[in-house]
């Protein structure tokens, strides 16, 4: 039975969406992105204890083997389950263009 | 420019497919899976240094922010990019059945 979203490590310790405010300089984008100049980056951070937000059967296997062989098999990892798109104005060889990136901001998280 | 598959940490140290031999007992499946009784579990293990097998723009952002704020933002994580299916013979209320699981064995890996 899945524990779902109940974090056994305490509030906010388990895999969840975090927002990090970043400038283009922070992101290493200053040389090719013109706008927006600041980004609210949403990313997945936190621990993946047993049965917490398990993405699939593979995550379940990984956790079981991690408990068995912790030095060989790492615990599941907190990663995006889906993404939010974001439009950037970027430099091109011929000028500037608008480009939509579908894999830039995490929308929700799970453990894999 | 992406480094692609060249691991800067030395051979076998970066994110790649590993095979772990496991019994049904190891996997915690002994009470519901009848066959196979042993599984060659393929999973993604290894470090994700900068530009190594970056899955997407999000992974690139995460690595840049990790370098900037290592205590807040973890490095990208080695996870399956795709899966191989596997058929299990499992117990049911009425007997046994064959079930294909599409998300059980990692096929290849990337960093997210």
């Amino acid at each position: 039975a899945r524990n779902g979203d109940r974090c056994p490590l305490g509030p906010g310790r388990c895999c969840r969406l975090h927002t990090v405010h970043a400038s283009l300089e922070d992101l290493g984008w200053a040389d090719w992105v013109l706008s927006p100049r600041e980004v609210q980056v949403t990313m997945c951070i936190g621990a993946c204890p047993s049965q917490f937000r398990e993405a699939n059967m593979h995550a379940q296997i990984k956790m079981n083997l991690h408990r068995l062989k912790p030095d060989t098999v790492p615990a599941p990892c907190c990663v995006p389950a889906s993404y939010n798109p974001m439009v950037l104005i970027q430099k091109t060889d011929t000028g500037v263009s608008l480009q939509t990136y579908d894999d830039l901001l995490a929308k929700d998280c799970h453990c894999v | 420019a992406r480094n692609g598959d060249r691991c800067p940490l030395g051979p076998g140290r970066c994110c790649r497919l590993h095979t772990v031999h496991a019994s049904l007992e190891d996997l915690g499946w002994a009470d519901w899976v009848l066959s196979p009784r042993e599984v060659q579990v393929t999973m993604c293990i290894g470090a994700c240094p900068s530009q190594f097998r970056e899955a997407n723009m999000h992974a690139q952002i995460k690595m840049n922010l990790h370098r900037l704020k290592p205590d807040t933002v973890p490095a990208p994580c080695c996870v399956p990019a795709s899966y191989n299916p596997m058929v299990l013979i499992q117990k049911t209320d009425t007997g046994v059945s064959l079930q294909t699981y599409d998300d059980l064995l990692a096929k290849d890996c990337h960093c997210v």
């Epitope: 927002t19 405010h21 013109l34 927006p36 600041e38 980004v39 939010n84 974001m86 104005i89 500037v96 | -």
Partner: antibody
Framework: QVQLVQSGAEVKKPGSSVKVSCKAS????????ISWARQAPGQGLEWMGG????????NYAQKFQGRVTITADESTSTAYMELSSLRSEDTAVYYC???????????WGQGTMVTVSS | DIVMTQSPLSLPVTPGEPASISCRSS???????????LDWYLQKPGQSPQLLIY???NRASGVPDRFSGSGSGTDFTLKISRVEAEDVGVYYC?????????FGGGTKVEIK
């Protein structure tokens, strides 16, 4: 082609609040920022604030700080601008517009007339 | 706040003739990336504003090539090579270098 459809005209009493909605029809916000501006009768445009993906935190003009709240609900593709403590000088047409950051406002709502009168 | 000043206030034009609108900012809009954070908008009578030019000189999608933007730093110009009857309305420049975003007072273009 995405359109921004705003809620209808409002008549409000001084001291009250108004909440104007802005819905993306024929699509979502698709990764664009949403800015709000207003135009008093016969006057120019005045920027109030904006919100960028993932629509968590808004940026406001100092003039409106503490009186304006901009939010967005991605699930319904709707942005909102709430202005409180209304006074007669807030009588204006309020516009939402999608942009990239604060610039390139390429799609605008039809505008919502808000009249503040006792 | 950056103050945007437009001239002239009103511009009577003859169809087929060129027209030019000036916009001055109280401080430079040239970012260190080499781009000017200035847009031009047209508000036709009874309509919402529409984007003409972004980042100083880039024509927005669907905007006729008779519209062009030029200038750098604090002095900018919007030119219409051959005015058409449908070009009447109020033209606004807008700076997006820093918040609050500010607009010029507008230039009303009308047919003679």
């Amino acid at each position: 082609q995405v359109q921004l459809v705003q809620s209808g005209a409002e008549v409000k009493k001084p001291g009250s609040s108004v909440k104007v909605s802005c819905k993306a029809s024929g699509g979502t916000f698709q990764g664009y920022a949403i800015s709000w501006a207003r135009q008093a009768p016969g006057q120019g445009l005045e920027w109030m604030g904006g919100i960028i993906p993932p629509y968590a935190t808004a940026n406001y003009a100092q003039k409106f700080q503490g009186r304006v709240t901009i939010t967005a609900d991605e699930s319904t593709s709707t942005a909102y601008m709430e202005l409180s403590s209304l006074r007669s000088e807030d009588t204006a047409v309020y516009y939402c517009a999608r942009g990239v950051g604060e610039l390139h406002l390429d799609v605008w709502g039809q505008g919502t007339m808000v009249t503040v009168s006792s | 706040d950056i103050v945007m000043t437009q001239s002239p206030l009103s511009l009577p034009v003859t169809p087929g003739e060129p027209a030019s609108i000036s916009c001055r900012s109280s401080q430079s809009l040239l970012h260190s990336n080499g781009y000017n954070y200035l847009d031009w908008y047209l508000q036709k009578p009874g309509q919402s504003p529409q984007l003409l030019i972004y980042l100083g000189s880039n024509r927005a999608s669907g905007v006729p090539d008779r519209f062009s933007g030029s200038g750098s730093g604090t002095d900018f110009t919007l030119k219409i090579s051959r005015v058409e009857a449908e070009d009447v309305g109020v033209y606004y420049c807008m700076q997006a270098l820093q918040t609050p975003i500010t607009f010029g007072g507008g230039t009303k273009v009308e047919i003679k």
